[in-house]
């Protein structure tokens, strides 16, 4: 039977001779050279050689356990003379014994990690891992221990796990953002003589909102013309915040000051500046300077940092309103004046007033816009704004005169303003009433006395306050011996009545009847109108059948025969 146990061979042999492995030996071997030993299998004849007489095995090359830890070979012992095996072929193992010839190697040459600034001590950052190719089952060749070579006192590493943690309180990104940490992994449990490897860990502190916004100055001053429309930007202010990104976002607001209602502040969404804008129309003459208290605050605040103080800051903004030369302002938006139509030329109707609203209070001169008074009926005193007539008026021609008055700054003619002036012409009884139409009527030859042959109506261009009251009568020269009578109906109408029974058209074909119409106003106005009455032949119903042709061409005028 074979006489051997497992063979062990130390790796990485560096001697000058072949490395002795062990001896194959059969108890049939009497030492007389009659047996021959043969080796086959992993590396036989190349890595491993055997002395066929003695059975001694040697390794011809330096072996690396990490490359191949076990070799499986087969042994034979045969009788040289007969060539027959004296032992059955048997498998045996050469196990390569580990030495500490491999240093730990990290899974990454460079690690990148982040951790929030101001983290508590012991906050996990990243875990690094190193592996050692040596035999973990034998000795400490592969027992890795981690340590920090660079990066203290900021970070620490757990020796067994490779977990990197923060080691210093209140690490501030605004102070230092980047850290390069060097970690060593050493085998042999970290003991002397152990092999080591290193890796670099680049650690970036990420931002947290641990800084409030701060105005670089306590007071800002801007100017804006009083003419700036609402929405106009008038200046920019900027609070700085040492944080970044969302933590550096700033909201601006006006918290106090007389300009609270007059101005607004918005945040420029890109530059994070505060833009002061006009909210309402300004007036230099009312207020020349405004003071605002503007606050800058972080919209997103981390409660754990509130102990550092409020996450806001305020500054005073002084806004100077600049005077803009404004046109004169009339005391009214429109003027309504009245004047009697019988007013003499140069009669004063009333006056307008305009003032320069500017602090300078420049004097103004007045004028009438002649496009609105082409006939030059009115004029104005350029100095005091008195309006007076320059022509006679007639209410019956034009009741309202709509003119425009201009006020112009004497020192700056470009600055002018206009106001409408509505002048009402008041009625005076200067028109006599007259017939509403031309009256030409007829009377039947067989008419009876007191028969109504025509109703008269009158009109008057005047417009008396209490309404028209007309009276009608026959003209004095026709009143006596007239063939007709006038009956005043007291309702601004009158009737013509026959005064006798029967008329003869052959005797008198046409009567001209003069009628006096008077009004009831002061001074009384009257006129005389003529009514033409033709005598006609009529049927028994009183319908006209024929009249004298002369009547159609008879001149109008007074007829003594009426």
């Amino acid at each position: 039977s074979w006489m051997w146990n497992q063979f062990f061979l130390l790796e990485e042999y560096t001697g000058s001779d072949y490395q002795y492995v062990g001896k194959l030996h059969s108890d049939q071997d009497r030492g007389d050279g009659s047996l021959k030993y043969i080796l086959s299998g992993d590396g036989a004849g190349d890595l491993f050689i055997i002395n066929e007489n003695t059975g001694d095995i040697q390794a011809t090359k330096r072996l690396d356990r990490e490359e191949k830890p076990v070799y499986i070979l087969r042994a034979q012992a045969i009788n040289r003379r007969t060539g027959r095996p004296v032992e059955p072929e048997s498998e045996f193992i050469i196990k390569i014994h580990d030495i500490n010839d491999n240093e730990p190697i990290f899974t990454k040459e460079v690690y990148t990690a982040t951790v929030p600034e101001m983290s508590d001590v012991g906050t996990f950052v990243v875990q690094v891992t190193a592996t050692d190719a040596d035999d973990p089952t034998y000795g400490n060749s592969a027992k890795v221990v981690y340590s920090i070579l660079q990066g203290q006192p900021y970070f620490s590493v757990e020796s067994e796990t490779g977990i990197i943690k923060t080691a210093l309180l209140n690490m501030d990104r605004e102070n230092r953002e980047q850290y390069q940490v060097v970690i060593q992994a050493k085998d042999m449990g970290g003991q002397m003589g152990g092999l080591s490897g290193t890796t670099t860990v680049n650690i970036t502190l990420t931002d947290v909102n641990d800084n409030p916004p701060r105005f670089p100055q306590s007071t800002y001053q801007f100017k804006t013309p009083e003419s700036s429309p609402p929405g106009t930007p008038i200046g920019r202010i900027k609070a700085s915040d040492a944080d970044v990104g969302e933590n550096a976002e700033i909201e601006y607001s006006i918290t106090d000051g007389e300009g609270l209602d007059m101005f607004d502040v918005i945040t420029d969404q890109e530059t994070q500046e505060g833009i002061i804008t006009v909210k309402k129309l300004l007036d230099f003459e009312k207020k020349k300077v405004y003071t605002l208290k503007v606050e800058a605050s972080n919209p997103y605040v981390e409660p754990r940092f509130l102990y550092l103080g409020p996450f806001k800051d305020s500054a005073t903004v002084r806004i100077v309103v600049e005077d803009v030369d404004e046109p004169p302002v009339f005391s009214k938006l429109a003027y309504i004046l009245q004047i009697r139509e019988d007013a003499q030329i140069n009669t004063t109707i009333g006056s307008v007033t305009a003032q320069d609203p500017d602090a300078a209070r420049n004097p103004v001169k007045y004028s009438v816009d002649r496009h609105t008074d082409m006939d030059r009926i009115f004029n104005i005193d350029s100095g005091n704004g008195s309006i007076f007539t320059s022509k006679l008026l007639d209410r019956e021609t034009l009741l309202w005169h709509n003119i425009t008055v201009i006020a112009t700054e004497i020192n700056n003619p470009k600055q002018s303003s206009r106001v409408p002036l509505y002048i009402k012409v008041l009625d005076v009884n200067d028109n006599a009433p007259e017939f509403a139409e031309f009256y030409e009527t007829f009377v039947c030859e067989k008419a009876k006395a007191d028969q109504l042959i025509q109703t008269l109506h009158a009109v008057d261009k005047d417009d008396p306050y209490s309404g028209h009251q007309f009276s009608f009568s026959l003209a004095p020269e026709a009143a006596s011996g007239s063939n007709f009578t006038i009956q005043d109906n007291k309702d601004n109408t009158a009737g013509i009545l026959t005064r006798k029974n029967g008329y003869n058209r052959h005797e008198m074909s046409t009567y001209l009847l003069p009628v006096v119409i008077s009004d009831n106003d002061y001074p009384v106005q009257s006129s005389t109108g003529t009514v033409t009455v033709r005598v006609c032949a009529c049927d028994h119903h009183g319908n006209m059948q024929s009249c004298h042709a002369e009547a159609l061409i008879h001149p109008t005028g007074l007829s003594t025969g009426a």
Epitope: I266, Q269, E270, T271
Partner: antibody, heavy 121, light 107 residues
């Protein structure tokens, strides 16, 4: 005077690409976020993309309908805005406007004349 | 995403009329973030009212804006012939969104 002039529009087949440019002048380009807005024929306005300023790392935002197909970019040294349009679809047919916000980067105050992109086979 | 709904979608009115267009947001927004635009056929949109209330440069005073939270309004006090156009509201929170538009036509 603020001026925005778009170019690069034209006829392209579905699946094709096109690059629009916008030349800006009359204002400080570097302080404004910039946008592309489009309008399909006879339809309403649709925002396409926005790019922020350098301070904000040139952050970009897109409408869902163009995400992963369109890329907005800017060249501050040339006062120029770009829109790279890939994998074009027929529904991308529209007039594309280059638009600058108002002061404070609110609203869309200044619009170019637009450039027509037609996607058709 | 914040949706904006304009009403009415279209509107017929006469010169001199007072017109109101409303814009309703699906969730509350700051008045700073709501704006109104006018667009005429074949033209680029024009900023009309910014930050809910403020008239853009050159915009006549007959235009006004109001509102807060989720409800905003554009008012034209006395329509002029040049006001017939399409009006859009828009909000600033990414993704920026527009209302569907209100077409104002001559009656």
């Amino acid at each position: 005077e603020v001026q925005l002039v778009e170019s690069g529009g034209g006829l392209v087949q579905p699946g094709g690409s096109l690059r629009l440019s916008c030349a800006a002048s009359g204002f400080t380009f570097t302080t404004y976020a910039m946008n592309w807005v489009r309008q399909a024929p006879g339809k309403g306005l649709e925002w396409v993309a926005r790019i922020r300023i350098k301070n904000n790392n040139y952050a970009t935002y897109y409408a869902d309908s163009v995400t992963d197909r369109f890329t907005i970019s800017r060249d501050d040294s040339k006062n120029s805005l770009y829109l790279q349009m890939n994998s074009l679809k027929t529904e991308d047919t529209a007039v594309y406007y280059c638009v600058r916000p108002d002061y404070g980067n609110y609203g869309l105050a200044y619009w170019g004349q637009g450039t027509l992109v037609t996607v058709s086979s | 995403d914040i949706q904006l709904t304009q009403s009415p979608s279209s509107l017929s009115a006469s010169v001199g009329d007072r017109v109101t267009i409303t814009c309703s947001a699906s969730s509350s927004i700051s008045s700073h973030y709501l704006h109104w635009y006018q667009q005429k056929p074949g033209k680029s949109p024009k900023l009309l009212i910014y930050r809910s209330f403020y008239l853009a440069s050159g915009v006549p005073s007959r235009f006004s804006g109001s509102g807060s939270g989720t409800d905003f309004t554009l008012t034209i006090s006395s329509l002029q012939p040049e006001d017939f156009a399409t009006y859009y509201c828009q909000q600033d929170i990414v993704p920026l969104t527009f209302g569907q538009g209100t077409k104002l036509e001559i009656k």
